[in-house]
Every structure is written in structure tokens, then in C-alpha cells.
């Protein structure tokens, strides 16, 4: 079956939050369809959603195998309604990704607030850590699994009735703060891999959560 | 096979310049931190720093801080330690290891040590 | 700084028996996110590089025999070695990987009776 009329992919971009990593592509195919193959530096190619009509490929069970190695995945068009030939000899166009390097390149997933306890003029806020889809013995890991003392929670908390924000940091997942008592405050939380050099060294802040709402207790 | 392979052992004097290296293969150099480790003559193990080759990040220990530089060339796979004046109280064994390949797991790896000899 | 401190400093096994070392750490180094300890036990023979022998406080590093086996959570660790081998022979440092800077017990050393 021939390759004429088929158009190389392009613009092949890398999505990755939380090491769920999906490959996307242009252009929407008219009469054409696409398959993707992924490979590690020194392994072989693998082939992923075959013959797909579809501009995105979901790699993730492939990445977490080893989030730290650097991996390049490649689209090849073909013909709509194409059936692999075994006397096919013609190779499909095809276009290469960048390199991707899941642990140094994946976005950090918007953190949550897991809970706030007040206990006098001290509050203990806890931050959700967060599941990923990289294993261990068949068990998930989690964000603070992967990336240990690399990973950071930066906190931000002010008074509900005022706009004057203070920040703590934290490399576990719980904040300690001093507040004045009888206030209410504010948190948000952001994670961050100080290590990292470029602009996927922060996530996206938390909602933001107000003692006097349910995820809050007081205790005197 | 992950392999880390240092530099061999040298002599110098008080005041001198030195660097000694560190060189990685067998895995992805970018992605993992080279620590820096000291056991001086006779005695336990100091952690010196680390640095992620990836990024050039580096982390050090406050007693270490300014006396030594950490660096890295990543289109080699090779880590630094380096000493712009040695004293005769640096004189030790010192190792190069690789983190873990989960978070906090220790250092899985270990170079087979350089011995720095500093006498006048 | 986080300290770590051995106990005991050195000890004499009959091969075939039971050793053990204590570790304690002057602040916790339970991770509250996962619920993991991080502290890392290491043999160094002599004349060699240290090895890694347990991560995580109590997960064996890939190769180590399971006469290794490692628990404790908080401050309070501890390394057994069901029982002692002639190449068990050594010093043993515990460590604190939870939080900079890296910090190493002053060591153990085992020797065989």
C-alpha cells in the first residue's frame, strides 16, 4: 500500500503532569492515520495506538517503567484504511518528538490541601500527597516516592482580613505556623523541585482553603 | 552495568589547586545526584554535597561550603570535586555514589574511592 | 544538623549468631506525606567503598542477603543480622537521607569472634 498522499506529523509535544504523559501531534488527519513508537536511548522501538485516527498517544504505562531515563517516540502516517503488508517495503513518513526525561521534565500536578488543625496560636497544615502511576512491586507510588527530599511544598497563608501574604516551606508534607489568635487565615500551597532550572519548577498554586470551613478544626 | 569510576590518588602540597572526578556510565547521568563523601584516615563518613547533573543543581554541606566546588559535565557523564587551596587537614579518601533510583533510597552506587595526599 | 547515634560502637559475634546495632536520630525522619523513615543502613568491608544494605528503614537493597533486615520508625532504628557470616565482618553506618545535610552515625564495627 503506498504513501503518497500522506502527510508527516508535526509539532510533537510532550504533556506530562505527575508522570501522566501523553504525546500530541499535528495535523488532524484527513484520510490518513497514525502510529506511534517510543524507545529509550539505547533500547528498541516499541509500537503504540496503532493505526489511530486520533492526534495524541497516551505513553505513560511506558514512561513509568524508568521515569529517569530520557525516551524519543516517533509518528508515522499512514494511508487511511491501511493494513500492515508483509511485501511492504516502502517506510511510512514519519516525524521524531524531542527527547523527553520524565523525571526532570514531567509538571508538578496541582497540590491539594489535605487538612488544617489550629491549637492555640500554632496551625498544622497538611498537604495531600499525591498518587502517580510509576510503580514499585506492583504498589503506586507516590510524588514524595519519587522524588524524596528533590520535592518541596511551599505554603502561603494570610489573614483572612487582609491581603498581606506570608510564606514557609517545607520538604515533608506538613507546615507549622504560628498565627495570632482569634484570626482566621487563609492557605494555599505550592509544589516545587528546587533543583529544577526551568519554568516546570513549580506547580500551579492549590485552592485556596479559610479556617471556619470544613477542612479546618479549632482546638484551644 | 552502573559503573562509577574516580580518578586516581594524588599528592599535593598545602595551598595547591586540585580536581578530581567522578565518571558515570551504565545509566542516565542526568537524572541521578552524584554525592560527595569524605572518610579521612582511620575515622567515619562525612557527606560533603551533591549535585543533579540534569540541572547543575547543587547542595552542600555548611562545613564543606566555600572550600570545595561541585560540578558537572553532563556531555561527558562526569561529576567534579574541586579545592583551589588544600590544607594538610584534607587529606582523606574521597568517594563519589549515586542516589537511588527512588526518592530518599540511599546511595546504591559507589565510585572505588581517591586518595588525596596533602603534605608539605 | 540532624545527629545520628550508634550503639554500639563496636561488637564481637560468634559466627552464626544474632548481631545487632541501634541508630537514633536526634529528630524524626518519618516523612509525613508517604509514611516512610528515611534512613539508610551501609556496610563498608575493609578496604572497599562502602554498599547500601537497607533504604526506607526497612527495604533491602536488590543483592542483600535476607539475613539483613532493617525496622525502626521515627528516631529509633535498628539493624539485625539473623545470623553472622565471617564476611559480615565490617563497619555499619546508619544515615539520615530525609533532610539536608546528609548525615552518617559515627559507625559500627563487627567483628568475628
Known amino acids: 500500500s503506498g504513501t503518497t498522499n500522506t502527510v508527516a506529523a508535526y509539532n510533537l509535544t510532550w504533556k506530562s503532569t505527575n508522570f501522566k504523559t501523553i504525546l500530541e501531534w499535528e495535523p488532524k488527519p484527513i484520510n490518513q492515520v497514525y502510529t506511534v513508537q517510543i524507545s529509550t536511548k539505547s533500547g528498541d522501538w516499541k509500537s503504540k495506538c496503532f493505526y489511530t485516527a486520533d492526534t495524541e498517544c497516551d505513553l505513560t504505562d511506558e514512561i513509568v517503567k524508568d521515569v529517569k531515563q530520557t525516551y524519543l517516540a516517533r509518528v508515522f502516517s499512514y494511508p487511511a484504511g491501511h493494513v500492515e503488508s508483509t511485501g511492504s517495503t516502502e517506510e511510512p513518513p514519519y516525524e521524531n518528538s524531542p527527547e523527553f526525561t520524565p523525571y526532570l521534565e514531567t509538571n508538578l500536578g496541582q497540590p491539594t490541601i489535605q487538612s488544617f488543625e489550629q491549637v492555640g496560636t500554632k496551625v498544622n497544615v497538611t498537604v495531600q500527597d499525591e498518587w502517580t502511576l510509576v510503580r514499585r512491586n506492583d504498589t503506586f507510588l507516590s510524588l514524595r516516592d519519587v522524588f524524596g527530599k528533590d520535592l518541596i511544598y511551599t505554603l502561603y497563608y494570610w489573614k483572612s482580613s487582609s491581603s498581606g501574604k506570608k510564606t514557609a516551606k517545607t520538604n515533608t508534607n506538613e507546615f507549622l505556623i504560628d498565627v495570632d489568635k482569634g484570626e482566621n487565615y487563609c492557605f494555599s500551597v505550592q509544589a516545587v523541585i528546587p533543583s529544577r532550572r526551568t519554568a516546570n519548577r513549580k506547580s500551579t498554586d492549590s485552592p485556596v482553603e479559610c479556617m471556619g470551613h470544613e477542612k479546618g478544626e479549632s482546638r484551644e | 552495568e552502573v559503573q562509577l569510576v574516580q580518578s586516581g590518588a594524588e599528592v599535593k602540597k598545602p595551598g595547591e589547586s586540585l580536581r578530581i572526578s567522578c565518571k558515570g556510565s551504565g545509566y542516565t547521568f542526568i537524572t541521578y545526584w552524584i554525592e560527595w563523601v569524605r572518610q579521612m584516615p582511620g575515622k567515619g563518613l562525612e557527606w560533603m554535597g551533591d549535585i543533579l547533573p540534569g540541572s547543575g543543581s547543587t547542595n552542600y554541606n555548611e562545613n564543606f561550603k566555600g572550600h570545595v566546588t561541585i560540578s558537572a559535565d553532563k556531555s561527558i557523564s562526569t561529576a567534579y570535586l574541586q579545592w583551589s587551596s588544600l590544607k594538610a587537614s584534607d587529606t582523606a579518601m574521597y568517594y563519589c555514589?549515586?542516589?537511588?533510583?527512588?526518592?530518599?533510597?540511599?546511595?546504591?552506587?559507589w565510585g572505588q574511592g581517591t586518595l588525596v595526599t596533602v603534605s608539605s | 544538623d540532624i545527629v545520628m547515634t550508634q550503639t554500639p560502637l563496636s561488637l564481637s559475634v560468634t559466627p552464626g549468631q544474632p548481631a545487632s546495632i541501634s541508630c537514633k536520630s536526634s529528630?524524626?525522619?518519618?516523612?509525613?506525606?508517604?509514611?516512610?523513615?528515611?534512613l539508610t543502613w551501609y556496610l563498608q568491608k575493609p578496604g572497599q567503598p562502602p554498599q547500601l544494605l537497607i533504604y526506607w528503614a526497612s527495604t533491602r537493597e536488590s543483592g542483600v542477603p535476607d539475613r539483613f533486615s532493617g525496622s525502626g520508625s521515627g528516631t529509633d532504628f535498628t539493624l539485625k543480622i539473623s545470623r553472622v557470616e565471617a564476611e559480615d565482618v565490617g563497619v555499619y553506618y546508619c544515615?539520615?537521607?530525609?533532610?539536608?545535610?546528609?548525615?552518617f552515625g559515627q559507625g559500627t564495627k563487627l567483628e568475628i569472634k
Open positions: 544515615q539520615n537521607d530525609y533532610t539536608y545535610p546528609l548525615t
Open positions: 555514589a549515586r542516589s537511588g533510583y527512588y526518592g530518599n533510597s540511599g546511595f546504591a552506587y
Open positions: 529528630q524524626s525522619l518519618l516523612s509525613s506525606g508517604n509514611q516512610k523513615n528515611y
